[in-house]
Interface confidence: medium
Amino acid sequence: MVSPRMSGLLSQTVILALIFLPQTRPAGVFELQIHSFGPGPGPGAPRSPCSARLPCRLFFRVCLKPGLSEEAAESPCALGAALSARGPVYTEQPGAPAPDLPLPDGLLQVPFRDAWPGTFSFIIETWREELGDQIGGPAWSLLARVAGRRRLAAGGPWARDIQRAGAWELRFSYRARCEPPAVGTACTRLCRPRSAPSRCGPGLRPCAPLEDECEAPLVCRAGCSPEHGFCEQPGECRCLEGWTGPLCTVPVSTSSCLSPRGPSSATTGCLVPGPGPCDGNPCANGGSCSETPRSFECTCPRGFYGLRCEVSGVTCADGPCFNGGLCVGGADPDSAYICHCPPGFQGSNCEKRVDRCSLQPCRNGGLCLDLGHALRCRCRAGFAGPRCEHDLDDCAGRACANGGTCVEGGGAHRCSCALGFGGRDCRERADPCAARPCAHGGRCYAHFSGLVCACAPGYMGARCEFPVHPDGASALPAAPPGLRPGDPQRYLLPPALGLLVAAGVAGAALLLVHVRRRGHSQDAGSRLLAGTPEPSVHALPDALNNLRTQEGSGDGPSSSVDWNRPEDVDPQGIYVISAPSIYAREVATPLFPPLHTGRAGQRQHLLFPYPSSILSVK
């Protein structure tokens, strides 16, 4: 218990801490500029991303991951992600050439809090939003996805890239820049303005006026290529992928000594290369160029192919599976991949979260709860089952008139009416003689408790069903001595048999009362009786806690990924979607203990472990 004074002190401390503790601000920002998105060159290029006559617009998503670290599947965009604004609306013009599509304004910016890793993986998705009048608002679909791994120093110039995804082509530029006070190629060094009373670290000279201290001293080795080199310490020159040499000016796999052309160098004895097909490195995406007798050849890094390594082939190395998906590559490391998606996600990259509640799975007014890893229905009072499909008390609040008894079953109540009444609620008077119940010409008389038959000569019984034979023999069993045949009023049973019949009738009456309380079950195995222990949340986690009935043992499909199978058990009256199992709270005590049979993990509950004929007692 915290006193008011103590709580005031606590809140003051929190406020002070918030003021004086350093605020978490990004170390830097990765910026992505999309230049164009449209059909790529070559045959089979799509005319338009929009469906015929339906306007659409584009937007982009970028996902960044540290390139060299093995990222956990749960954090697919460990460096961050960003979504662009929606682009202008585009409508396909019939017959017009396929254009580059109108793009969203501005940059995609991904702030990063920690050090910029230098090597990173990116995934850029192009999404289409269709603006037709479809039910449920606009429809989104993924048009293209490109991915790659790059080296990039923070603070460097914009790097340009072209990527192809299927028949689409995406042109873009990107850079990483530090946010003050962070500086350096990894944005790990902090600087204060010159006015602040501090000095830079060892080996750093004071800054020029109006410049930030520590900013100026980081100068790479003189002549270090600004396009292909970078430095993290003053005076060094480190090369981006695909480049080598002391100043990062030599493409990998090309050496001046290998070229047969050009004059010899006096200092090295090597041939000084003249202009050749590999000059300027025509190989994109870090590919290395080597000359061939006729032209050049690119050796592409993993995940790229094409004459100039310009085509991106996304592989598992690019981490393309979102939302904890497991990436399974093809037999060849460079071949296509398949994302195995966890429950609740689908799509080729597990990028689509299924709004399973929109399918309205909960019946009878149940509330649908999508908990991510599980889909649950919270049932209204009186309903149970994974989708609230079982009516626990069909008769609640419904009365049967004129002494009728309510019988539940199948989600709707039914009245078993007293003799002389009929209709849904036993409100209609019924003529018990209308059905001509008296056999062999017997006359029927209606009566407050039912009917009476006056039998024609030669017949007897409640419905005149037994003939009385002229020779004195009866259709009934032989009467004990001293009794006249055809005298049912005085036809006595032996005491033991009489007791047995009485017990049977009493038992049947009890059973009928129970049936009327609990309801007829069409399938004895499709209903759980009370007395079944409620599953404990500690017993078996997830779907194994669901009590399964005979009907649910392997008939019906396994759940689709949209209906995710692995679920939690909630003992607070929430019913777990795990069709066709039933997990219900019970309301009545059974007459007989349930019989537990069947395979492990299943319970079959037999409603009446007695012959069913006992239920036909009139």
Epitope: V328, G329, A331, I338, H340, C341, Q346, P557, S560, V561
Partner: nanobody, 119 residues
Framework: EVQLVESGGGLVQPGGSLTLSCVAS????????MGWYRRAPFKQGELPAG???????AYADSAKVRFTISRDNAKNSVYLQMNSLRAEDTAVYYC?????????????WGQGTLVTVSS
């Protein structure tokens, strides 16, 4: 539709081994991916292992060295051999089956088999 039945779960001591089996039946296709998903109480679920139609395997970091996934296409089955089991491997293991039709992946899940690692 596809039905999946897992077996092989049970109680095992830390450091012990267990092999889970899963059989797919129903309208299965040869172009499918299979694997295992596990959920422990109060933990986020994960996919420890998967195998593609051509037999390529993938493992989560937590399962890389200790678990081996294999499949028998003739029997429409997938297996998970788990060695050096630890307490944190205790979970319900669900077999899954994906097949792609017209670019859409359909996923199916079994009922699960409980693996308890405890001394």
């Amino acid at each position: 539709e596809v039905q999946l039945v897992e077996s092989g779960g049970g109680l095992v001591q830390p450091g012990g081994s267990l092999t889970l089996s899963c059989v797919a039946s129903g309208s299965t296709s040869s172009i499918n991916a299979m694997g295992w998903y596990r959920r422990a109480p109060f933990k986020q679920g994960e996919l420890p292992a998967g195998i593609s139609p051509d037999g390529t395997k993938a493992y989560a970091d937590s399962a890389k060295v200790r678990f081996t996934i294999s499949r028998d296409n003739a029997k429409n089955s997938v297996y998970l051999q788990m060695n050096s089991l630890r307490a944190e491997d205790t979970a319900v293991y669900y077999c899954y089956y994906f097949h792609t039709v017209c670019g859409t992946s359909m996923g199916y899940w079994g009922q699960g088999t409980l693996v308890t690692v405890s001394s």
